[in-house]
C-alpha cells in the first residue's frame, strides 16, 4: 500500500478541515485507511478520521477541527492498520479555503439595476467574518460568450448590476465565491447558481 | 457557546464518599478533556485528575486510590467520586475543559464543598 | 512533581500601572506555562497559554513572556476589572500543578 500524491489539506478556519490524498491503486477508503490528527501541543487529545473514497484511488478526510487560531499546527498521520504511510503536519492558518457564501438572490431594484445579495459564510465573532472579497460571474444562460466578473473588495456582500449592461430580455444566471486576502487564501466553491430574466428595455 | 456547570451535595460526613456532576454544553465530550481541580478555602488550586476525549482517565497520584472519574458521552456529563473524605478536602470543585495541550481553557463555577459532620 | 512558584503572594498597583506578576517552575518547562485570572466570585478564565499565546477574547493588555523556568505576566494598563488572584500553570507533564497565587490590589 503505498500514497501516490501526499495529503493536502484545506481549512474553512471555523469548524472543519478536509484533507485529500491519491493511493498507488484503487483503494476502499474507509475499510483500510486512517488519518490520524493531533494539536501539536503536549496533552492535546489524538483525533482518528475515517477518510471516503472521492475516486477510485482518491480518498478525502473530514475532521472537525475546533476554535482554530494563527498558531496552530497539526501532526497528521496516516495508517494502513499498522503501517504508517505517510507523516507530516498541517497549518490551518496557511491553508484556508473559506466556506461558501450562501443565499444568492437578485432583486430589481431603483434606477434600473439588479441587486445581488448572499449571506456571509461565517458569524461575526470569526476571524474571517470581516476578511473576506467576494468574485460574482454572471453569464447569459444562451450565450456562452457573454459573461461577466465582478470582484466585491468592499464589505457587504452586495453587488448593484445596471440592468443596462446585460442583454434586454435573456435570462441570467449569478454564482459568488469568496476569499481571504490576509490569510491568503485559495478561492471557495463556487455558490449554488441563481436565474433571472433581464426584462430591461433600453 | 461552551459551558461547564458542576452540583454537588454541599455538604458530606468525614469518612463518606463525594459525587460530583460536571454537566456540559456547546462542546462534545469525546472530542475533548475534562479536568477537575479544587481550591480550599483561602489556598490555591490543586489538580486532581482528568478523563481524555476517548475515556482514559489520568490522576494526581496523591489521590489515586480515593478518585475514580467517569463520563456520559451522550448526557455530555462527567462524574467525579472521591472517597473516604476528611475536613482537609473542604474546597471549592471545579471542572474544566481543555482543547490546547494542558491549558484549561474553560472553567465551570465551581461547587462548594464542606466536609464535616 | 514540579513545583511551581510564585514568590508574590499580594501586589498593590494604581489603574493604569503596568503590572508584572513572576512564576518559577523547579524544572524546565520547555514553554507550556499558561496564566490564569481568578475573580473574587471565584470565577475562573484562562489569559496566556504556552507562555504568551493570548487566548482568544483576552483584551491584549495582557502579555506573557519567559523561558526554561522563569515566566512571566504583564498587564500593560491597569485597569479596573483586573483586580483578581493570577495563578500560574505548567502544562508539561502530569500532574498539571499551580503556583500558589498573586492577589492584585488597588493602591
Known amino acids: 500500500v503505498k500514497v501516490l500524491h501526499e495529503p493536502s489539506c484545506f481549512s474553512d478556519y471555523i469548524s472543519t478541515s478536509v484533507c485529500q490524498w491519491k493511493m498507488d491503486h484503487p483503494t476502499n477508503c474507509s475499510a483500510e485507511l486512517r488519518l490520524s490528527y493531533q494539536l501539536d501541543f503536549m496533552g492535546s487529545e489524538n483525533h482518528t478520521c475515517v477518510p471516503e473514497n472521492r475516486e477510485d484511488s482518491v480518498c478525502v478526510c473530514s475532521m472537525p477541527i475546533d476554535d482554530a487560531v494563527e498558531a496552530d499546527v497539526y501532526q497528521l498521520d496516516l495508517w494502513a492498520g499498522q503501517q504508517l504511510l505517510w507523516s507530516g503536519s498541517f497549518q490551518p492558518s496557511k491553508h484556508v479555503k473559506p466556506r461558501t457564501p450562501g443565499n444568492l438572490t437578485v432583486h430589481p431594484n431603483i434606477s434600473h439595476t439588479w441587486l445581488l445579495m448572499w449571506t456571509n459564510p461565517y458569524p461575526t465573532e470569526n476571524h474571517l467574518h470581516s476578511e473576506l472579497t467576494y468574485m460574482v460571474n454572471v453569464s447569459n444562460d444562451n450565450d456562452p460568450e457573454d459573461f461577466k466578473v465582478y470582484n466585491v473588495t468592499y464589505m457587504g456582500p452586495t453587488l448593484r448590476l445596471a440592468a443596462s449592461t446585460l442583454k434586454s430580455g435573456a435570462s441570467y444566471s449569478a454564482r459568488v465565491r469568496a476569499w481571504a486576502q490576509t490569510y491568503n487564501s485559495t478561492w471557495s466553491d463556487w455558490s449554488p447558481s441563481t436565474t433571472w430574466l433581464n426584462y430591461y428595455e433600453p | 457557546q461552551v459551558q461547564l456547570k458542576e452540583s454537588g451535595p454541599g455538604l458530606v460526613a468525614p469518612s463518606q464518599s463525594l459525587s460530583i456532576t460536571c454537566t456540559v454544553s456547546?462542546?462534545?465530550?469525546?472530542?475533548?478533556?475534562v479536568h477537575w481541580v479544587r481550591q480550599p478555602p483561602g489556598k490555591g488550586l490543586e489538580w486532581l485528575g482528568m478523563?481524555?476525549?476517548?475515556?482514559?482517565?489520568d490522576y494526581n497520584s496523591v489521590f489515586k486510590s480515593r478518585l475514580s472519574i467517569s463520563k456520559d458521552n451522550s448526557k455530555s456529563q462527567v462524574f467525579l467520586k472521591m472517597n473516604s473524605l476528611q475536613t482537609d478536602d473542604t474546597a471549592m470543585y471545579y471542572c474544566?475543559?481543555?482543547?490546547?495541550?494542558?491549558?484549561?481553557?474553560?472553567w465551570g463555577q465551581g461547587t462548594s464543598v464542606t466536609v464535616s459532620s | 512533581d514540579i513545583q511551581m512558584t510564585q514568590t508574590t503572594s499580594s501586589l498593590s498597583a494604581s489603574l493604569g500601572d503596568r503590572v508584572t506578576i513572576s512564576c518559577r517552575a523547579s524544572q524546565d518547562i520547555s514553554n507550556y506555562l499558561n496564566w490564569y485570572q481568578q475573580k473574587p466570585d471565584g470565577t475562573v478564565k484562562l489569559l496566556i497559554y504556552?507562555?504568551?499565546r493570548l487566548q482568544s477574547g483576552v483584551p491584549s493588555r495582557f502579555s506573557g513572556s519567559g523561558s526554561g523556568t522563569d515566566y512571566c505576566l504583564t498587564i500593560s494598563n491597569l485597569e479596573q476589572e483586573d483586580i483578581a488572584t493570577y495563578f500560574c500553570?505548567?502544562?508539561?507533564?502530569?500532574?498539571?500543578?499551580f503556583g500558589s497565587g498573586t492577589k492584585l490590589e488597588l493602591k
Open positions: 500553570q505548567q502544562a508539561n507533564t502530569l500532574p498539571l500543578t
Open positions: 504556552y507562555t504568551s
Open positions: 456547546g462542546f462534545s465530550l469525546s472530542r475533548y478533556s
Open positions: 474544566a475543559r481543555t482543547y490546547r495541550g494542558y491549558a484549561l481553557d474553560y
Open positions: 478523563i481524555w476525549g476517548g475515556g482514559s482517565t
